[in-house]
C-alpha cells in the first residue's frame, strides 16, 4: 500500500519519499561527512591478525575512529533536532491542509522515521563497541611490543657478551697459531740440517757399495769352490744312509707332541683359515696370557681385531684405570679389549686403526689411521696416530699429538677439570678434546645437546651422541 523510496539529491542529501494514494511526501535529511559509504564496507575484525600492527599505524587508526565517533554523535543529535523540527512543521501543515484520513499516514511516517533513528542508534552502539574492542586489542599489542622489545634487548646483551668471549678465544687461538708458525720454522730448519746430513751419508754409502761389489766378485769365485765341496759331502751322506738302512732294528721313539695353536691377533686367525666372524682366543705377545676378542673377518678384507664396541648402552663404560687396562664387557656385545693388550700388540709391529661410526639417522662413516700404537702403562697408554683418511671428518677427532689415557681414577688430561669424571668414560682426553667414544650412551631422541655422550666432533659436532661405534686394528702389512 505504501510506496517508500530512498535516493540521493544533487547536493548529496538523502531523500525519503513516501507515496500514499494521490499524495507524496518527501523528507530531506542531512548526510554525515565522515561515515563509511556502502562501497567500502567496514571490516570488524581488522585487528585480529597474527603479526602485530605497527605502533604508529595503530595510533592513527585510533584517532580516525575517535573522529568518526564524534561525528556520529553530532549527526545523531542533528537528526533528532531535525526530526523534531520537521515533525512540528509537518503536523501544523497536516492539521491545516490535510484531509482527516491523512493523519494516520503521517503517524506511520513518523513511526518509520523513529524506527530508522533507532536503527541508526543501534549501528552507532555497534561502532562504539567495535572501537572499544579495537582499543583493548591495541593496548594488548602495545604491551606485547614492549615485552618483545625487552626480550630483544636481553638477547642483544647476551650476544654481545658471547661475541666478547669469542673475540677473547680468537685472540688466544691467534697466539697459538703464531706459536705454531714459529715452531714450524724451527722444524723446517732442523729438517734442512737432517737433509744435509743424509746427503753426506748417501755419498758415504755409495763408496761402501762400490767396495761391496768388489767383494761380491771375490765371493762368487769362492762360491763355486764351496759348491764342489757340498756335492762331495752329499755323496758321503747318501752312502751313510744306505749303510744305516740295513740296520733297521728299532723304531723312532720320538712322537710329536700336539701343540696348542695360539694367535696373536685376528689377522693371524684369518691367515690360519678361520674366516668367519666371531670370538677367538688371542695370546699376548711374548707371554702365555690369553684374552678373548671379537674378530671381524668380513669388513675390508677381514682380519680386524675389535678393541672397542658400543651399540646399545648395555655396558657401563665409566670404569677404573685397572678395568680399562685389562678390559671389560663381552666380546659379542659392548666391550673394551684392554689397554695393556693393545699396547703390547701395537708395539710389536705396525698396526692401522679403523674407527667405524653410526648415527641415529642411518648414516655411517669411518676414520682410518695408517699408523697406530699405544705407549706402555708407565706412559699412561698415550695414543700415537698418523695418516688420517676416511669419511668421518678431514680433521682428526682424536687430538693431535696424542694424549695420555684418563679414567675417573686416573686423571692425565690437559684440563684443570677432570675430563673423565665430567664427560664420563676413559679416553685420550685433551682439555677435554673433540672426541669420546666411551661416553654415556644416550638413546634416540635423547642424543642431542649432550656434552657427555659418545662424541666424534668432526663428523657430528659436539652435542651429538652416536648410536654405535667400533674401533678395530689390523697389521699394516695384512
Amino acid at each position: 500500500y505504501n510506496n517508500f523510496r530512498k535516493s540521493m539529491d544533487s547536493i548529496g542529501k538523502k531523500q525519503y519519499q513516501v507515496q500514499h494514494g494521490s499524495c507524496s511526501y518527501t523528507f530531506l535529511l542531512p548526510e554525515m561527512d565522515n561515515c563509511r559509504s556502502s562501497s567500502s564496507p567496514y571490516v570488524s575484525n581488522a585487528v585480529q591478525r597474527d603479526a602485530p600492527l605497527e605502533y604508529d599505524d595503530s595510533v592513527q587508526r585510533l584517532q580516525v575512529l575517535e573522529n568518526i565517533m564524534e561525528n556520529n554523535t553530532q549527526w545523531l543529535m542533528k537528526l533528532e533536532n531535525y526530526i523534531q523540527d520537521n515533525m512540528k512543521k509537518e503536523m501544523v501543515e497536516i492539521q491545516q491542509n490535510a484531509v482527516q484520513n491523512q493523519t494516520a499516514v503521517m503517524i506511520e511516517i513518523g513511526t518509520n522515521l523513529l524506527n530508522q533513528t533507532a536503527e541508526q542508534t543501534r549501528k552507532l552502539t555497534d561502532v562504539e563497541a567495535q572501537v572499544l574492542n579495537q582499543t583493548t586489542r591495541l593496548e594488548l599489542q602495545l604491551l606485547e611490543h614492549s615485552l618483545s622489545t625487552n626480550k630483544l634487548e636481553k638477547q642483544i646483551l647476551d650476544q654481545t657478551s658471547e661475541i666478547n668471549k669469542l673475540q677473547d678465544k680468537n685472540s688466544f687461538l691467534e697466539k697459538k697459531v703464531l706459536a705454531m708458525e714459529d715452531k714450524h720454522i724451527i722444524q723446517l730448519q732442523s729438517i734442512k740440517e737432517e737433509k744435509d746430513q743424509l746427503q753426506v751419508l748417501v755419498s758415504k754409502q755409495n763408496s761402501i757399495i762400490e767396495e761391496l761389489e768388489k767383494k761380491i766378485v771375490t765371493a762368487t769365485v769362492n762360491n763355486s769352490v764351496l759348491q764342489k765341496q757340498q756335492h762331495d759331502l752329499m755323496e758321503t751322506v747318501n752312502n751313510l744312509l744306505t749303510m744305516m738302512s740295513t740296520s733297521n732294528s728299532a723304531k723312532d721313539p720320538t712322537v710329536a707332541k700336539e701343540e696348542q695353536i695360539s694367535f696373536r691377533d685376528c689377522a693371524e686367525v684369518f691367515k690360519s683359515g678361520h674366516t668367519t666372524n666371531g670370538i677367538y682366543t688371542l695370546t699376548f705377545p711374548n707371554s702365555t696370557e690369553e684374552i678373548k676378542a671379537y674378530c671381524d673377518m668380513e669388513a675390508g678384507g677381514g682380519g680386524w681385531t675389535i678393541i672397542q664396541r658400543r651399540e646399545d648402552g648395555s655396558v657401563d663404560f665409566q670404569r677404573t684405570w685397572k678395568e680399562y687396562k685389562v678390559g671389560f664387557g663381552n666380546p659379542s656385545g659392548e666391550y673394551w679389549l684392554g689397554n695393556e693388550f693393545v699396547s703390547q700388540l701395537t708395539n710389536q709391529q705396525r698396526y692401522v686403526l679403523k674407527i667405524h661410526l653410526k648415527d641415529w639417522e642411518g648414516n655411517e662413516a669411518y676414520s682410518l689411521y695408517e699408523h697406530f700404537y699405544l705407549s706402555s702403562e708407565e706412559l699412561n697408554y698415550r695414543i700415537h696416530l698418523k695418516g688420517l683418511t676416511g669419511t668421518a671428518g678431514k680433521i682428526s677427532s682424536i687430538s693431535q699429538p696424542g694424549n695420555d689415557f684418563s679414567t675417573k681414577d686416573g686423571d692425565n688430561d690437559k684440563c684443570i677439570c677432570k675430563c673423565s669424571q665430567m664427560l664420563t668414560g676413559g679416553w685420550w682426553f685433551d682439555a677435554c678434546g673433540p672426541s669420546n667414544l666411551n661416553g654415556m650412551y644416550y638413546p634416540q631422541r635423547q642424543n642431542t645437546n649432550k656434552f657427555n655422550g659418545i662424541k666424534w666432533y668432526y663428523w657430528k659436532g659436539s652435542g651429538y651422541s652416536l648410536k654405535a661405534t667400533t674401533m678395530m686394528i689390523r697389521p699394516a702389512d695384512f
Epitope: Q260, H274, I279, T283, G327, N330, P331
Partner: antibody, heavy 119, light 107 residues
C-alpha cells in the same frame, strides 16, 4: 636369569662311555665359550674341557685328552661332553660353567651331575 | 701348566674373626686370579676376579689382594654363612687351574 642344567650322569664300568649334556638358558648361548669342570669326592676343582663359541676350538688337559670330546649345538643351546674309555679316577661331579666374556673366570655354574666309574 | 698352591688346607675360626687365605702361582700371572666359595653339595660361587674386584652382590667383608705370584683372600669379620671351602683360580692362560682349596671350619 642364567641357568645351566646338567644331565646324563650315572654309574658306568671302567672302559665304558657316557655322554653328559648341559641345557643353557637366560643368555645368548652362542656368544660365550663354555667349560666342563669336575670335582672328585672330597677333592678340589679340576678343569676338564673348553669349547669356543663356534666350536672350532677345543681344549683339554692331558688327563682326558683323546678320551673326552666337548661339543655344542648353538641352535639347541646345548653343551655336551662325550666320555670314552672311562677310568675309576674319572669319578666326580661334573659341572658345566660359563665365563664372564673376556677371560675365563666362571660366573655361572650348573648344579652338577655325578659320574661314578666302578666295576 | 700354571700350578696354584693354597694355604692353609683348612683352618678353624670363630664368628667375628679376621680370616686370611693365601694362594701362590707357579709363575707370574699378573692380577689374573679369581676366588670362589663352595658349600657342601653346591656349585662354587664367584667372589672375586682380577685379584681384587668383588663380583656383584658379594659382601664387602670379602676382599682380595696381590699380584705376580702371591695372592690373598681376606674375610674381615667371619659370619656364620661364611663357613665353607674357598678356591683360588688363575684366569691368565689355558688351562685355567685351581688351588686345592681351603676349608674354613667353626672353632
Amino acid at each position: 636369569q642364567v641357568q645351566l642344567v646338567e644331565s646324563g650322569g650315572g654309574l658306568v664300568k671302567p672302559g665304558g662311555s657316557l655322554r653328559l649334556s648341559c641345557a643353557a638358558s637366560g643368555f645368548t648361548f652362542s656368544d660365550y665359550y663354555m667349560y666342563w669342570v669336575r670335582q672328585a669326592p672330597g677333592k678340589g676343582l679340576e678343569w676338564v674341557a673348553t669349547i669356543s663359541v663356534g666350536g672350532s676350538f677345543t681344549y683339554y688337559p692331558d688327563s682326558v685328552k683323546g678320551r673326552f670330546t666337548i661339543s655344542r649345538d648353538n641352535a639347541k643351546n646345548s653343551l655336551y661332553l662325550q666320555m670314552n674309555s672311562l677310568r675309576a679316577e674319572d669319578t666326580a661331579v661334573y659341572y658345566c660353567a660359563r665365563d664372564w666374556g673376556l677371560r675365563p673366570w666362571f660366573v655361572y655354574w650348573g648344579q652338577g651331575t655325578l659320574v661314578t666309574v666302578s666295576s | 701348566d700354571i700350578q696354584m698352591t693354597q694355604s692353609p688346607s683348612s683352618l678353624s675360626a670363630s664368628v667375628g674373626d679376621r680370616v686370611t687365605i693365601t694362594c701362590k702361582a707357579s709363575q707370574d700371572v699378573s692380577t689374573a686370579v679369581a676366588w670362589y666359595q663352595q658349600k657342601p653339595g653346591k656349585a662354587p660361587k664367584l667372589l672375586i676376579y682380577w685379584a681384587s674386584t668383588r663380583h656383584t652382590g658379594v659382601p664387602s667383608r670379602f676382599s682380595g689382594s696381590g699380584s705376580g705370584t702371591d695372592f690373598t683372600l681376606t674375610i674381615s669379620s667371619l659370619q656364620p654363612e661364611d663357613f665353607a671351602t674357598y678356591y683360588c683360580q688363575q684366569h691368565y692362560s689355558t688351562p685355567p687351574t685351581f688351588g686345592q682349596g681351603t676349608k674354613v671350619e667353626i672353632k
